[in-house]
């Protein structure tokens, strides 16, 4: 019996609080053998798939989704799910992306650095809304 698929994780680089116009990269991680990672926004209303999967470690693979210039509309909840044929994993926890006006002050860093506690996450729900296959500002970051 093959084991059930481990739950993916999600993080954001350089952090989860991003100044308007800056870039952010969502990093989805799962086991080796993943064919497709999907980054979902606000449950399943918007998503983007990538097959540009790299091996992060001997036991882990990852995919990166980059937004070059963050807008206010990019703020929201994001989560990852992956497809390791022939089935999908469960969803990761939610990660909340916050977009702030650039203040430019010396005492206010541009981004919130990742802490040991990890990014802001909310437990994923089990609702299954209809999804619309639209990327809306998300694109796969090609690593090659």
């Amino acid at each position: 019996q093959e084991e059930d698929l481990p739950r993916p994780s999600i993080s954001a680089e350089p952090g989860t609080v991003i100044p308007l116009g800056s870039h952010v990269t969502f990093v989805c991680r799962g086991p080796v053998g993943v064919q497709t990672f999907r980054l979902e926004r606000d449950s399943r209303s918007t998503y983007n798939d990538t097959e540009d999967v790299s091996q992060a470690s001997p036991s882990e693979s990852e995919a990166r989704f980059r937004i070059d210039s963050v807008r206010e509309g990019n703020a929201g909840l994001y989560r990852c799910i992956y497809y390791k044929p022939p089935k999908w994993s469960e969803q990761s926890d939610y990660l909340e992306l916050l977009v702030k006006e650039s203040s430019g002050g010396p005492d206010s860093p541009d981004t919130e650095p990742g802490s040991s506690a990890g990014p802001t996450q909310r437990p994923s729900d089990n609702s299954h809304n209809e999804h619309a296959p639209a990327s809306q500002g998300l694109k796969a970051e090609h690593l090659y």
Epitope: D4, P6, P86, K87
Partner: antibody, heavy 123, light 113 residues
Amino acid sequence: QIQLQQSGAELARPGASVKLPCKASDYIFISYGLNWVRQTTGQGLEWIGEIYPRSGHTYYNEKFKGKATLTADKSSSTAYMELRSLTSEDSAVYFCARRSVFYDYDKNGFDYWGQGTTLTVSS
Amino acid sequence: DIVMKQSPSSLRVSAGEKVTMSCKSSQSLLNSGNQKNYLAWYQQKPGQPPKLLIYGASTRESGVPDRFTGSGSGTDFALTISSVQAEDLAVYYCQNDHSYPFTFGSGTKLEIK
């Protein structure tokens, strides 16, 4: 409406190869897995393999490795299965079928099927 | 490989009767991560390809009459037709959609008296 079109019948000689087409229409070809299933009176329904047209990734039933090769042409939304070194044992109906779980992870199973190609291997 | 066993191999019933057929898998088809059973049921009429009736063990495919009901979880599944109609004459197959290689049961042939 969504369709998977297959050639109705094929006749081949023992030892030859045959390439069976399956043309998809009215859906996004690269967003779904495309599977091949064989039906014989003796063995019932047997899964041969699956191809993901976006990437070309293929997954085979061990039993059909070396016998079947799956390919897909994204430009024409057509999947192909080549069967080689044919024998009378390969005489069967071959179906292509769409598996929608890759598009919609709440769904599984084969939701659309072609009408099937009847392959007869005879000298 | 996951082995799918269907019973009975054939059923002969009168129109209007309720009928239940069984499907047992040699391994669990439940993905504990998302609590989904990767089990599908098909109806195949003579000269036609199989038609998807039920997926996820219990979800009716769009357009399938509500007299068809799928149930079960893990390794034991059933398909029930609440009131058999003449047009239900067919062979019914269950299928493992959980793990490669996908496997089918040998079918239950439904005959109408």
